[in-house]
Every structure is written in structure tokens, then in C-alpha cells.
């Protein structure tokens, strides 16, 4: 988790002088509770936006927007703490809006936005906006939280972001898999424009089951520059197991920008259609 590096972060708007500060996620009002505290944010919304850094890189960001309730507690509102929590790692990043002038009611509802938290593709977050000062112990909560899901690199807009392109999102291997005689598969795919090696991971399954019955890994050495964008053809030998007929072929590249964590592409070969002829019924029943 990090903040987008460009421009001084601003939260001022007409009628309010405001500055954005880094925060430890532990506001002073937790330690020194105040008697009068503001009500919670209203209509918190989190959306996926995209923003460029000064270097021109494009990143997904969490666009956070909320409004204030139209009650007298805005007289005691000193700012807001914005927190983004990555759900699995428990990594948290916070910033604080510090109001340098008192808020006053005006003809339209106060609205705040912040779009500088950089988020990662395919990750899950909880976004919280706390109004400051925070409530006294056992006081009514004055925060709102929402969960937020960032799409993976297959999403059209995500595909062209810097983190996705770095993991190979623009590479389309156009995998074809052909079943040959003598328990073989021919796998064909388009190489990318980088001299890096690939792995083909073959996993076979019985019809309608998800437990694998055969696994095989095939290494493809790094292509020479004249082979870039060419088709690579590989023949894989299957284990002769009756019913082990559904094959998933996954191609894992090892691009320099993403190493072991590059996007994988896969193709599946289904089991052949069963003929509709009913099985003959035996004229005796076995005893076991």
C-alpha cells in the first residue's frame, strides 16, 4: 500500500482550509478523548479510478468520497482519518485531513474526496473514514467502512495499468491444444517479445471431477529474438489412464518484470462426448 507520488495532496475547498497529512492510524483523540465529537460520515463510496504518476505510469487507485450529515456536530468536526486495510496481509495505510478552519453550514452538503491510495490488482480491501475527533469509549461510532475489491488484470481498464503490464497482461499466447493419437497432446502458443523461459503445466482430471489424475511440467527454454511472436509447438505425452480425459494446460512465463509471479494463461480440453447408447444390463448380479 502506498500513496500516489504526484502533486501536493490537497483537501481544501471553498469555505474550508484543509491540509492532508500522513497518519499513524492512531489519532490523538483515541488517547485523549473529547467530550463533544462529530457524527459519522454519510454515503461513503469507494470506486476504482486510474491515475498517472509524474513519471507517466498508470496505477489503479481507490477513489474515496463521502458527505457530512446535516447536523450541528459539524461545529466540532476537526478533520477525518482515511484508512485502507489490505484484508489478508492486514497492512494498513492512513492519511489525515486536518481542518484549519471551522466548518459552517452552507446551502449544499459538504462533500470530500481522496484519490491517492494506490491499490493492487486482484486484491481485497476495507476502506474506513473516521471523523475526528474519534468518539469517547462506548460513544456512538463516528466512522463508516466499506469493503472494496480490485479487479484482476483481465479487466479491460486494469490490463493497461503499469502493474498489470509488468506482469505480462498484454501478452496473448492464443493457446491451442490438440489431442493426438497414442495419448498425446500438441500444445501451441505465441511467444512474447522477451528472451525468457516458459513452463507448460499439464493437469488432467477425470470427467466431472476436480481431483487431478495426472500432472506434468514441461520446460521451454528462452527463445532467440528472431523467434519472438512466433508459435511454439510442444507435444506432451499423457499417462494412459482410463477416464483421465479432461486436460488443463497452463502456460507460465517468467518475464523479467514479474519473475515467478507473472500472469498465467490456460486452456482446457474436455473429455470426449460419451455415446448415448445405454450400457447392457448383465443377466446376473455379482455378489460383491
Amino acid at each position: 500500500l502506498r500513496l500516489l507520488d504526484h502533486r501536493a495532496l490537497v483537501c481544501s475547498q471553498p469555505g474550508l482550509n484543509c491540509t492532508v497529512k500522513n497518519s499513524t492510524c492512531l489519532d490523538d483523540s483515541w488517547i485523549h478523548p473529547r467530550n463533544l465529537t462529530p457524527s459519522s460520515p454519510k454515503d461513503l463510496q469507494i470506486q476504482l479510478h486510474f491515475a498517472h504518476t509524474q513519471q507517466g505510469d498508470l496505477f489503479p487507485v481507490a477513489h474515496i468520497e463521502w458527505t457530512l450529515q446535516t447536523d450541528a456536530s459539524i461545529l466540532y468536526l476537526e478533520g477525518a482519518e482515511l484508512s485502507v486495510l489490505q484484508l489478508n496481509t492486514n497492512e494498513r495505510l492512513c492519511v489525515r485531513f486536518e481542518f484549519l478552519s471551522k466548518l459552517r453550514h452552507h446551502h449544499r452538503r459538504w462533500r470530500f474526496t481522496f484519490s491517492h491510495f494506490v491499490v493492487d490488482p486482484d486484491q481485497e480491501y476495507e476502506v474506513t473514514v473516521h471523523h475526528l475527533p474519534k468518539p469517547i469509549p462506548d460513544g456512538d461510532p463516528n466512522h463508516q467502512s466499506k469493503n472494496f475489491l480490485v479487479p484482476d488484470c483481465e479487466h479491460a481498464r486494469m490490463k493497461v495499468t503499469t502493474p498489470c503490464m509488468s506482469s505480462g497482461s498484454l501478452w496473448d499466447p492464443n493457446i491451442t491444444v490438440e489431442t493426438l493419437e497414442a495419448h498425446q497432446l500438441r500444445v501451441s502458443f505465441t511467444l512474447w517479445n522477451e528472451s525468457t523461459h516458459y513452463q507448460i503445466l499439464l493437469t488432467s482430471f477425470p470427467h466431472m471431477e476436480n481431483h487431478s489424475c495426472f500432472e506434468h511440467m514441461h520446460h521451454i527454454p528462452a527463445p532467440r529474438p528472431e523467434e519472438f511472436h512466433q508459435r511454439s509447438n510442444v507435444t506432451l505425452t499423457l499417462r494412459n489412464l482410463k477416464g483421465c480425459c479432461r486436460h488443463q494446460v497452463q502456460i507460465q512465463p517468467f518475464f523479467s518484470s514479474c519473475l515467478n509471479d507473472c500472469l498465467r494463461h490456460s486452456a482446457t480440453v474436455s473429455c470426449p462426448e460419451m455415446p448415448d447408447t445405454p450400457e447392457p444390463i448383465p443377466d446376473y448380479m455379482p455378489l460383491w
Epitope: N88, N90, E124, S145, K146, N147, F148, L149
Partner: antibody, heavy 116, light 107 residues
Framework: QVQLVQSGAEVKKPGASVKVSCKAS????????ISWVRQAPGQGLEWMGW????????NYAKKFEGRVTMTTDTSTSTAYMELRSLRSDDTAVYYC?????????WGQGTLVTVSS | DIQMTQSPSSLSASVGDRVTITCRAS??????LNWYQQKPGKAPKLLIY???NLQSGVPSRFSGSGSGTDFTLTISSLQPEDFATYYC?????????FGQGIKVEIK
């Protein structure tokens, strides 16, 4: 190939506890949380909570707080869900699923029958 | 907790039909909604996440739309393997909650 393989069916008496395991493979276990969802016979899906496989933090549905414990063993890439003080209405198929908000891979389910 | 209501409770359709299933949240979840398919005796399978994003490996005949409180799952041309129960699930607010499910049956 991402796979979540759960432990086998269990029959328990009311008041007892059950511990269901969920072994993950095919991805970095610590990179994605594990959620637990149950389904009573002929009923819909009910979210029980989730555990961070990275930090061990948990988030339980209020209904199960005090009665459920979710844990992980990163050395074996296994998540566990223990439910205590079982009642007959806890009879259900218990599923583990990868991730927290978007449950993209599921275990095959573990049937827990609570009967005296 | 946010209530998720799916309609109709069940529907009958034929192979090749265009099928639309709806899901309504008791309050706005913006785009925080997933769709799952479940066949008898099997675990659910994620189809759509974030209201409209197709999960990797899911056929393109499935699509999702909507935001706020009203969402739709559409199957453009129903296939024999699509006869199943479909659940929506919101994830914007804790706790996560599921709809009651809609069974799509053969007419």
C-alpha cells in the same frame, strides 16, 4: 491448479465440537484469505467468517462469535474451522473458500451431522 | 445486516433461451456483488464478481450488470450444463450476505 481439499464427513452429538480442515494447493497459501460458508440441507448459503492466512486475524459473523474458531497452519497450507456446542440446526455442509470478498475457489464441502 | 432478495424463486427455461435473474439489496452495495452457480451435491462456483466482471474460465454467455440495489445475471443462450441454482452475494458491507438462490430448471 488451485485446489482446496476438505476433511471427511462427521457425525456429532449435541454439545460436542467439530474441527473441519481445508488443505490448499496450487497457489501461495499466505497470499489469500480463507472464508468459511455453510449450507444446511436444502437451504441457501450462510457466511461464517474468514481468516487471514498471512496474519491469522479473524472476522466472524456475529451469529457464530464465541462458538467458532478459525486457525491456519502455514507449514501445511491448511485452514481449520472449529465449531463448538453443536446443536441439531448446525447440521450442514461446511465449505472453505479462497479469498475474503470474492470466493473464487471452493472446497468440496464437509457434511457435519449433529444428532443424538 | 443487508438482505439480498432474488427473484423469481425458480424459473423454467429451455436450451437456447435468454435467461435473466435479478437480485435486490436492502440498501446500496454499489458494485459490491458476486454471482455463483451451484449444482446439486457440488460446491458453488464463482461466475461474476464486482457486479459485472467475468471470472476467469467462465463462458462469455454469462454477464452481470447493475449497481446500487438492483442487479441482474443474464445467460444469453442457456446450455444444458447451466441448469443449476444461482446465488448473489454482497460484499461491500460486513457481514457478507447471500441471496436465497434461484433454481433454473428445464422446461
Amino acid at each position: 491448479q488451485v485446489q482446496l481439499v476438505q476433511s471427511g464427513a462427521e457425525v456429532k452429538k449435541p454439545g460436542a465440537s467439530v474441527k473441519v480442515s481445508c488443505k490448499a494447493s496450487g497457489y501461495g497459501f499466505a497470499s489469500r484469505g480463507i472464508s468459511w460458508v455453510r449450507q444446511a440441507p436444502g437451504q441457501g448459503l450462510e457466511w461464517m467468517g474468514w481468516i487471514s492466512t498471512y496474519s491469522g486475524n479473524t472476522n466472524y459473523a456475529k451469529k457464530f462469535e464465541g462458538r467458532v474458531t478459525m486457525t491456519t497452519d502455514t507449514s501445511t497450507s491448511t485452514a481449520y474451522m472449529e465449531l463448538r456446542s453443536l446443536r441439531s440446526d448446525d447440521t450442514a455442509v461446511y465449505y472453505c473458500a479462497r479469498r475474503v470478498l470474492r470466493l473464487d475457489y471452493w472446497g468440496q464441502g464437509t457434511l457435519v451431522t449433529v444428532s443424538s | 445486516d443487508i438482505q439480498m432478495t432474488q427473484s423469481p424463486s425458480s424459473l423454467s427455461a429451455s436450451v437456447g433461451d435468454r435467461v435473466t435473474i435479478t437480485c435486490r439489496a436492502s440498501q446500496s452495495v454499489h458494485t459490491g456483488l458476486n454471482w455463483y452457480q451451484q449444482k446439486p451435491g457440488k460446491a458453488p462456483k464463482l461466475l461474476i464478481y464486482g457486479a459485472s466482471n467475468l471470472q476467469s474460465g467462465v463462458p462469455s454467455r454469462f454477464s452481470g450488470s447493475g449497481s446500487g440495489t438492483d442487479f441482474t445475471l443474464t445467460i444469453s443462450s442457456l446450455q444444458p450444463e447451466d441448469f443449476a441454482t444461482y446465488y448473489c452475494q454482497q460484499f461491500e458491507h460486513n457481514p457478507l450476505t447471500f441471496g436465497q438462490g434461484i433454481k433454473v430448471e428445464i422446461k
